[in-house]
């Protein structure tokens, strides 16, 4: 359905408010260092132009593609070369190469100041003074820090952000009302960003086929009563939506996501019995609700998979005639029967099945060759089950903070070349799997844990890709998307690592640690732990525990002292000396 003017088409479909918000997100995700006011100016110019095209689709430049229009607009920024360096070279290219160039320069870890939350009264005043600017600023700050944030979902977050201020700025105790809501939005937002980053990495690094396989498995678990053809249609549409968002085509993405939600709700009888409530909500809530909807009940009396995929004499014929369709059917049938498996496990099983058919359907006795293929699945299923059991036991024994510390030590020994902030961030997030998933019953643990770990390890992969320092990380990140977690799990201590030179400054602490939040204080201690392991990778658990216990006691003691700074200086020296002796540094 070609439109004379793409920009007019999207403006009319989305409405002015969403159009402006999405253009702002797109621009902030591309030019992450530009000041807010510059972006607002660009967005207003694009919006005014879009309105002229709505009035007359034949007007000058209205027939240009959105990439051309947006790219031309971004390339008018005067300080492009000074602020972004080689990204300015993108502007010398023609579309579609120019957009690809902008995409390649998206920075997962931009050098931006941490967002500091002002006092509640200050925020409420700003909200009341200029609600529109306040909400735009939210979109801008999130988008520039999370250049792959799922744009239509960010609109949903902004709606909730607005609702929180609307309600809480009138409350008797504004802070008690607002702060928990903002904490929840922040945590959910980080999780949403990380989940979407994995989808984009899947599409960009491993291709559409990998993403479609993931989607078949996930949607088949969620909608086990839906026919394969229905699931396939949803997968195709969902792939288009995410391809667009990951490619910076945010207007098309939001528009297509709305169409997909509409389709799902119009056809919920043939998709899932769990959609009713979602489909009664307004658009943004509806789309979010559908994306998070619980798995439908599995149909009763599903036949054994072996009949069609092992015992049938037509296995190789069906496979050879349409490989991806046949493998898709296998994945669909397996996934709908196994909501208790992680998506990545299901994909490993499908890969094993594919590899077996590739081999056996060229063998002299194909049936004898693939007859035992399901037996090969057993160790693949048991590996994550055992790992989750062990780690949940460890988590329950240690609690979240100490479990994170155990993972910090484990991962620093595996990949000590990785930067300390990255190791701390990733290990802390890996450690959160405990409180997130270990509370679940057995049937929900694996999908919760392993699919969450895939998201966290992808953070490590994208951060490492920016400045690669470890061949082992590169290998685990690039060889196989579904085997990343087993690859990292299998890494042993890096025996080639030359321990870091001891630097007393790294272990010097000041009184400012006492005023930090509990979370920030933990991060300081965990940073020290990583550095300790980098200095002494062969240190035992017991040695490290002793040093960390001494460190905790030292912080607690000095934070209670009258002259905190002197205490930190004097006791700190003693602690460093004692630690060096304990670890033999």
């Amino acid at each position: 359905d070609a439109h004379k003017s793409e920009v007019a088409h999207r403006f009319k479909d989305l409405g002015e408010e969403n159009f402006k918000a999405l253009v702002l997100i797109a621009f902030a995700q591309y030019l992450q260092q530009c000041p807010f006011e510059d972006h607002v100016k660009l967005v207003n110019e694009v919006t005014e132009f879009a309105k002229t095209c709505v009035a007359d689709e034949s007007a000058e430049n209205c027939d240009k593609s959105l990439h051309t229009l947006f790219g031309d607009k971004l390339c008018t920024v005067a300080t492009l070369r000074e602020t972004y360096g080689e990204m300015a070279d993108c502007c010398a290219k023609q579309e579609p190469e120019r957009n690809e160039c902008f995409l390649q320069h998206k920075d997962d870890n931009p050098n931006l100041p941490r967002l500091v939350r002002p006092e509640v009264d200050v925020m409420c005043t700003a909200f009341h003074d200029n609600e529109e600017t306040f909400l735009k600023k939210y979109l801008y700050e999130i988008a520039r820090r999370h250049p792959y944030f799922y744009a239509p979902e960010l609109l949903f977050f902004a709606k909730r952000y607005k609702a929180a201020f609307t309600e809480c700025c009138q409350a008797a105790d504004k802070a008690a009302c607002l702060l928990p809501k903002l904490d929840e939005l922040r945590d959910e937002g980080k999780a949403s960003s990380a989940k979407q980053r994995l989808k984009c990495a899947s599409l960009q690094k491993f291709g559409e086929r990998a993403f479609k396989a993931w989607a078949v498995a996930r949607l088949s678990q969620r909608f086990p009563k839906a026919e394969f053809a229905e699931v396939s249609k949803l997968v195709t549409d969902l792939t288009k939506v995410h391809t667009e968002c990951c490619h910076g085509d945010l207007l098309e993405c939001a528009d297509d996501r709305a169409d997909l939600a509409k389709y799902i709700c119009e056809n919920q009888d043939s998709i899932s019995s769990k959609l009713k409530e979602c489909c009664e909500k307004p658009l943004l809530e509806k789309s979010h609700c559908i994306a998070e909807v619980e798995n439908d009940e599995m149909p009763a009396d599903l036949p054994s998979l072996a009949a069609d995929f092992v015992e049938s004499k037509d296995v190789c014929k069906n496979y050879a005639e349409a490989k991806d369709v046949f493998l898709g059917m296998f994945l669909y049938e397996y996934a709908r029967r196994h909501p208790d498996y992680s998506v990545v496990l299901l994909l490993r099983l499908a890969k094993t099945y594919e590899t077996t058919l590739e081999k056996c359907c060229a063998a002299a006795d194909p049936h004898e060759c693939y007859a035992k293929v399901f037996d090969e699945f057993k160790p693949l299923v048991e590996e994550p089950q055992n790992l989750i059991k062990q780690n949940c036991e460890l988590f329950e024994q240690l609690g979240e903070y100490k479990f994170q510390n155990a993972l910090l030590v484990r991962y620093t020994k595996k990949v000590p070349q990785v930067s300390t902030p990255t190791l701390v961030e990733v290990s802390r997030n890996l450690g959160k799997v405990g409180s997130k998933c270990c509370k679940h019953p057995e049937a929900k643990r694996m999908p919760c844990a392993e699919d969450y770990l895939s998201v966290v390890l992808n953070q490590l992969c994208v951060l490492h890709e920016k400045t690669p320092v470890s061949d082992r990380v590169t290998k685990c990140c690039t060889e196989s998307l579904v085997n990343r977690r087993p690859c990292f799990s299998a890494l042993e201590v890096d025996e080639t690592y030359v321990p870091k030179e001891f630097n007393a400054e790294t272990f010097t602490f000041h009184a400012d640690i006492c005023t930090l939040s509990e979370k920030e204080r933990q991060i300081k201690k965990q940073t020290a732990l990583v550095e300790l392991v980098k200095h002494k990778p062969k240190a035992t658990k017991e040695q490290l525990k002793a040093v960390m216990d001494d460190f905790a006691a030292f912080v607690e003691k000095c934070c209670k002292a009258d002259d905190k700074e002197t205490c930190f200086a004097e006791e700190g020296k003693k602690l460093v000396a004692a630690s060096q002796a304990a670890l033999g540094l």
Epitope: C316, K317, A363
Partner: antibody, heavy 118, light 106 residues
Framework: QVQLQQSGAELVRPGSSVKISCKAS????????MNWVKQRPGQGLEWIGQ????????YYNGRFKGKATLTADKSPTTAYMQLSSLTSEDSAVYVC???????????WGQGTTLTVSS | QIVLTQSPAIMSASPGEKVTMTCSAS?????MHWYQQKSGTSPKRWIY???KLASGVPVRFSGSGSGTSYSLTIRSMEAEDAATYYC?????????FGAGTKLELK
């Protein structure tokens, strides 16, 4: 491009053994069956057996069990066929061929002529 | 094992003539493949999976069949088509070849 390069012609005594090689290049050697085919002068083709270098699995034509032994080495990407207790009946051209899905042989070696004579 | 009987054993055809050779299996097979062999060279895959032409094979060739009866057809004989053609079955162990049909130019 895919190539299968076989070892040179062999003249051997009855009762002895011989090992013929087939060096593969231009494709993922581990992921395809390597088949061996016998052709006696002026006669048809006879399938001997196949080996999957990825894991060493083999299938043999019952007529050649005990006569032929198939092996493969992944590092020089080479398949081997050892023929034992040779008689004049084993004099033939032996060809290696790559097997693909649904059992056809898409690439063939140039053949190795084996002559068993006293 | 499945026995493949090719007929005729030898045939000749003039340029431009239509040629059909058959391959009959002693019991049903899943797929049939055909190879062309010229004197002093190794066989070449010619038709595979019953009806697909191998790379570089002229479109005047075609393959068809199912069950126990298969055939290779040349729509219009050309001099370069003179060779021996072997059928090979897949679907039953051991893999077997027919004795060949020798096609000569008249």
């Amino acid at each position: 491009q895919v190539q299968l390069q076989q070892s040179g012609a062999e003249l051997v005594r009855p009762g002895s053994s011989v090992k013929i090689s087939c060096k593969a290049s231009g494709y993922a050697f581990s992921n395809y069956w390597m088949n061996w085919v016998k052709q006696r002068p002026g006669q048809g083709l006879e399938w001997i057996g196949q080996i999957y270098p990825g894991d060493g699995d083999t299938y043999y034509n019952g007529r050649f069990k005990g006569k032929a032994t198939l092996t493969a080495d992944k590092s020089p990407t080479t398949a081997y066929m050892q023929l034992s207790s040779l008689t004049s009946e084993d004099s033939a051209v032996y060809v290696c061929a790559r097997g693909v899905i649904l059992g056809s042989f898409d690439y063939w070696g140039q053949g190795t002529t084996l002559t068993v004579s006293s | 094992q499945i026995v493949l009987t090719q007929s005729p054993a030898i045939m000749s055809a003039s340029p431009g003539e239509k040629v059909t050779m058959t391959c009959s299996a002693s019991s049903s097979v899943s797929y049939m493949h055909w190879y062309q062999q010229k004197s002093g060279t190794s066989p070449k895959r010619w038709i595979y999976d019953t009806s697909k032409l191998a790379s570089g094979v002229p479109v005047r060739f075609s393959g068809s069949g199912s069950g126990t009866s298969y055939s290779l057809t040349i729509r219009s004989m050309e001099a370069e088509d003179a060779a021996t053609y072997y059928c090979q079955q897949w679907g039953s162990n051991p893999l077997t070849f027919g004795a060949g049909t020798k096609l000569e130019l008249k």
